[in-house]
């Protein structure tokens, strides 16, 4: 039996269902009783789903998973995962047997967008050219961590005096605060971008200083 | 400078009500998760109830349907509404940042006895 | 008693290194993020580890968490007095859909 997965890896969103396709090429003549199918973690080999003896085992992975018990007679063997988290993130292992075995492991990227980030002015009123000022962008509820970009009204880099932190819930979903302390010009434009490496989703925040009022 | 402040503490007689407050400071607090643990005197710590960003809440089986958690976002504060109270419900209550309570308050102290 | 176990009490000497377990379930540590807490005496906790083995910043690089299965550890290398504490696991619980903290265990610098 030759087992065959997708090579690229799955990407989830958190909170969302995902499939992680296997699938084998069933004999004529083939029955589920002669089917032993085994999902498990790649690295650690903790039992996640099971079919054996002609019926599904069920999840052993916090109840989440599920086969396609229709389709496992035609040699699907892909498993669902329910309401998918971070740590649900890495690699699976399908083990299929039925008179000799074959297994292939499939990698499970799971992701999160972040939040349109909220730009603050510190200070945020009295600014004269020549002031040092502290903007901060904050997005939220992220994964993985974020990166975040820094430009100026012309689209120039700004990479000096920048410091970014990031946060995370009991979700493992990060927060990230990025401050730029930088002098005022007359007038100015500056953009925060925060960037999910996994999505490639970009999230803009930008403030416009022209005297007073400012404009977020 | 992130700061958490919790009030309304006291004594109060079995069966009766208490609600603590939070006040927090230092960070945008509409974004954020917020929670209640507490501590009984020489005991370990017991998570009571959490408040997601979006007023989705979750609460320990000990307190379900007498605790009512809620946040009002204008006012920066996270309160712990505590009804029908129980001599076990005395404690030190600290509100923090999260469910797994990143930043947290000094702790209001709850005594409930006659 | 916690859903999440502990033991009562660790001790160890100036230098050494120590590890605190705890042992939860499939529902709780086997499928979930574990926190660690700090307490000294007569303060509020502090969050000492958090996403099982990060450290929030501050935090001295000689604390560090790991996972295995339904078990987490807190090591603690290069021990010192200020080090003695009760110290806390915590973590989601799927079954009972709320946040969990272990039962403590104190930790003794002999």
């Known amino acids: 039996v030759e087992v065959q997965v997708s090579e690229d890896p799955v990407v989830a969103l958190v909170d969302t269902d995902a499939t992680l396709r296997c699938s084998f090429s069933p004999e004529p003549g083939f029955s589920l009783a002669q089917l032993n199918l085994i999902w498990q973690l790649t690295d650690t080999k903790q039992l996640v789903h099971s079919f054996t003896e002609g019926r599904d085992q069920g999840s052993a992975y916090s109840n989440r998973t599920a086969l396609f018990p229709d389709l496992l007679v035609q040699g699907n063997a892909s498993l669902r995962l329910q309401r998918v988290r971070v740590t649900d993130e890495g690699s699976y292992t399908c083990f299929v047997s039925i008179q000799d075995f074959d297994s292939a492991a499939v990698s499970l990227q799971v992701a999160a967008p972040y939040s349109k980030p909220s730009m603050t002015l510190e200070p945020n009123k009295d600014l004269r050219p020549g002031n040092m000022v502290t903007i901060t962008c904050s997005s939220y509820q992220g994964y993985p961590e974020a990166e975040v970009f820094w430009k100026d009204g012309q689209g120039v880099p700004l990479t000096g005096n920048v410091t970014t932190s990031q946060m995370a819930n009991e979700r493992g979903l990060f927060d990230v605060h990025s401050v730029l302390r930088v002098v005022l010009g007359a007038n100015g434009t500056y953009s925060c971008l925060v960037r999910n490496p996994v999505l490639q989703q970009d999230a803009h925040g930008s403030v416009t200083i022209t005297g007073q009022p400012l404009t977020f | 400078e992130v700061q958490l402040l919790e009030s309304g503490g006291g004594l109060v007689q079995p069966g009766g009500s208490l609600r603590l407050s939070c006040a927090a400071s230092?960070?945008?607090?509409?974004?954020?998760?917020m929670s209640w643990v507490r501590q009984a005197p020489g005991k370990g710590l017991e998570w009571v109830a959490g408040i997601r960003s979006g007023s989705r809440t979750y609460y320990a089986d000990s307190v379900k349907g007498r605790f009512t958690i809620s946040r009002d976002n204008s006012k920066n504060t996270l309160y712990l509404q505590m009804n029908s109270l129980r001599a076990e419900d005395t404690a030190t209550y600290y509100c923090?940042?999260?469910?797994?309570?990143?930043?947290w308050g000094q702790g209001t102290t709850v005594t409930v006895s006659s | 008693q916690s859903v999440l176990t502990q033991p009562p009490s660790a001790s160890g000497t100036p230098g050494q290194r120590v590890t605190i377990s705890c042992s939860g379930s499939?529902?709780?540590?086997?499928?979930?993020?574990v926190h660690w807490y700090q307490q000294l005496p007569g303060t509020a906790p502090k969050l000492l580890i958090y996403?099982?083995?990060r450290r929030p910043p501050g935090v001295p690089d000689r604390f560090s968490g790991s996972k295995s299965g339904t078990s987490a550890s807190l090591a603690i290398s290069g021990l010192q007095s200020e080090d003695e504490a009760n110290y806390y696991c915590a973590t989601w619980d799927d079954s009972l859909n709320s946040f969990l903290f272990g039962g403590g265990t104190k930790l003794t610098v002999l």
């Open positions: 923090g940042r999260y469910f797994n309570m990143d930043v």
């Open positions: 230092g960070f945008s607090f509409s974004n954020y998760d």
């Open positions: 996403l099982t083995d």
């Open positions: 499939t529902f709780n540590i086997g499928t979930n993020l």
